[in-house]
Interface confidence: low
């Protein structure tokens, strides 16, 4: 089922450019902000920590000065700026701080922001928003199981961070749906989600709602699944 | 040098059982802490439990730590597993100078935990085909156990994708396999499950329409996306 808020934040940049990662920690009494990078298949590692009192970055050994810079646009707010990006800078960036919620020191991590660094020679289409294809329930399913499955296929989008949920028309309730993993196809991605509804709901319009950073005008795409008329179907006796 | 090793890259376990995640570490410090974190699919990193090097085995709810200082081993056990425990679990070693708050955590590579539905009677799937243009989807519903092979039968394949297999609300499995075919109208789906073969044609019904249930006459089947 869908959790609309449970989606990784994402920033996409080209090699050679710079990126900013916002720290979403809600603390107002810390002296140090730590920045970690987690790359798939590797252990998360600390890059640097920021000394709030002296406004100074302290880098881990081996990291090049000038690559990372923490700035604070306002009190208790931190942004990590990464310069001269290379593809190997891709990964999930976390800010963290030591906290003592129950009289025991623990390190609390913010939600994490995914940085995707692409090379300029990757020839992506100008429009990399999700392209939808709808599948309506098969007659067999509606007749035999008194239910119908709608499938929403989304293709040719970039980056791969996407959120899909389903609603009935004129309702804000998020319906329980299922989805496949996001899959890479050439330089873009595809994903599909499906919703099975009981027969009594087949005559209602359903919406597959897609949130993606490259949707037109930045708004959620709503893919309409029309109501289904089931009274035209007759069963073959052999299928009883 | 400080180092953390999580040798298990992934483990699977049914609901209600317990799973133990191993973690070995190397350190020259005498006093230190080990932390366990859970990483959700959204990549959020959630603190679970902390083990002090001079403390008794830590326990918090369903999480417990089996700490062996001499062996430099700190295993996490999650009992009474729930489906929501499916996630990646990281073990991390913390430096001792907490009062400074400048210390870093040294992480392992993590162990992915997959919690499977409870064991239940074997159930044969229902198989249905859905089509739109060259796109074909094979919908496989309510089967158990998980192992399954889905084959879209066509002589003119353009491309196929790996199937998505997910846990259904009933605790069984559902799956969808997608493909693109030049002869989509003639594509059928066959499924190998539990040493038996099930065909989509076994479920076909006679109809006075084409491949799909009709949208209401007032509706337009070629719906544009609203963006």
């Amino acid at each position: 089922s869908s959790n609309l808020e449970g989606r990784t934040k994402s920033v996409t940049r080209q090699t050679g450019s710079s990126a900013e990662i916002t720290c979403d920690l809600t603390v107002t009494n810390t002296f140090y902000i730590h920045w970690y990078l987690h790359q798939e298949g590797k252990a998360p590692q600390r890059l640097l920590y920021y000394d709030v009192s002296t406004a100074r970055d302290v880098l881990e050994s081996g990291l090049s000065p000038g690559k990372y810079y923490t700035h604070t646009p306002r009190r208790w707010s931190w942004i990590l700026r990464l310069q001269n990006l290379i593809e190997n800078d891709s990964g999930v960036y976390y800010c963290a701080t030591w906290d003592r919620p129950l009289n025991a020191w623990i390190k609390t991590f913010a939600k994490g922001t995914r940085l995707i660094v692409t090379s300029p020679d990757k020839q992506l289409d100008a429009d990399v928003s999700p392209k939808p294809t709808i599948f309506l329930p098969s007659i067999a399913e509606t007749k035999l199981q008194k239910a119908g499955t709608y499938l929403c296929l989304l293709e040719k989008f970039f980056p791969d961070v996407i959120k899909i949920h389903w609603q009935e028309k004129k309702s804000n309730t998020i319906l329980g749906s299922q989805e496949g993993n996001t899959m890479k196809t050439n330089d873009t991605y595809m994903k599909f989600s499906w919703l099975t509804v009981p027969e009594k709901s087949l005559d209602k319009e359903h919406r597959c709602i897609v949130r993606h950073e490259n949707n037109k005008n930045g708004v959620d795409q709503e893919i309409i699944f029309p109501p289904i008329k089931t009274d035209v179907i007759t069963m073959d006796p052999k299928d009883n | 040098a400080q180092k953390v090793t999580q040798a298990q890259s992934s483990v699977s376990m049914p609901v209600r059982k317990a799973v133990t995640l191993n973690c070995l570490y190397e350190t020259s410090w005498w006093s230190y802490y080990i932390f366990w974190y859970k990483q959700l699919p959204s990549k959020e990193m959630i603190f679970l439990i902390r083990q002090g090097s001079d403390e008794q085995n830590a326990k918090s709810g369903r999480y417990s730590v089996n700490f062996k200082k001499a062996a430099k081993s700190v295993a996490l056990t999650i009992s009474a597993l729930q489906l929501e425990d499916s996630a990646k679990y990281f073990c991390a070693l913390g430096e001792p100078n907490h009062f400074l708050n400048t210390d870093k955590l040294i992480f392992g590579k993590g162990t992915r935990v997959t919690v499977e539905p409870r064991s239940q009677p074997h159930t044969k799937p229902s198989v249905f085909v859905m089509k739109n243009g060259t796109n074909v989807a094979c919908l496989v519903k309510e089967f158990y156990p998980k192992d399954i092979r889905i084959n879209l039968v066509s002589s003119k394949k353009i491309t196929e994708f790996d199937p998505a297999i997910v846990i259904s609300p009933s605790g069984k499995y559902n799956a969808v396999k997608l493909g693109k075919y030049e002869d989509s109208n003639s594509v059928t789906c066959s499924v190998q499950h539990d040493n038996k073969t099930v065909h989509s044609t076994d479920f076909e019904v006679k109809t006075d329409s084409t491949d799909h249930v009709k949208p209401k006459e007032t509706e337009n089947t070629k719906q544009p996306s609203k963006s």
Partner: antibody
Framework: EVQLVESGGGLVQPGGSLRLSCAAS????????IHWVRQAPGKGLEWVAS????????YYADSVKGRFTISADTSKNTAYLQMNSLRAEDTAVYYC???????????????????????WGQGTLVTVSS | DIQMTQSPSSLSASVGDRVTITCRAS??????VAWYQQKPGKAPKLLIY???SLYSGVPSRFSGSRSGTDFTLTISSLQPEDFATYYC?????????FGQGTKVEIK
Amino acid sequence: EVQLVESGGGLVQPGGSLRLSCAASGFTVSSSSIHWVRQAPGKGLEWVASIYSSSGYTYYADSVKGRFTISADTSKNTAYLQMNSLRAEDTAVYYCARPYYWYPYYYWSGGWEYAAFDYWGQGTLVTVSS
Amino acid sequence: DIQMTQSPSSLSASVGDRVTITCRASQSVSSAVAWYQQKPGKAPKLLIYSASSLYSGVPSRFSGSRSGTDFTLTISSLQPEDFATYYCQQYGEYPITFGQGTKVEIK
């Protein structure tokens, strides 16, 4: 459908207190922020306070700091503005508003920096007079 | 605090006229500026966000632009329903601040 409904306004004497409510529907206040904006009779718009329930952040205009408290009850999906030590200059229509979610700023950064208000309540009138 | 100085405070125009309202921020607010329309007794309505993005459902005769710290709302061809008061707002920094408003009246 997103809706905000304010209530709790009325006539109160200087120095008195009132609590305004903003009942939200069509979205959850826990995943959004709620803002109060007021408008004195015949005057312009003035931002009053903001709350981010997920993080607990609150912000206030200098003119109300120390006197007004913004809060939210996520179980009731309602935000509140507790107004104490009211003055004649607090007389206004009070609106609650919700920020517009759009990529990339608001949804991704979790920050208030990029949040114009797309949904407003109908307003509730607060009159402070002896 | 960031002051938003809006001008003019009022203007008279006829249906079909091109109308321009400006707002100057006292310091940089990047593009975090919105424009609202308000009619008597009603709540404000969002027209433009992020300085130049048209909010969904708003007629395309409304447009916004930015030049440094100067922000402009343009109504390309004034319609009868456009007679109202317009406010700019910066939301790039707390405290959030509004311009004083521009009342667009019938000539």
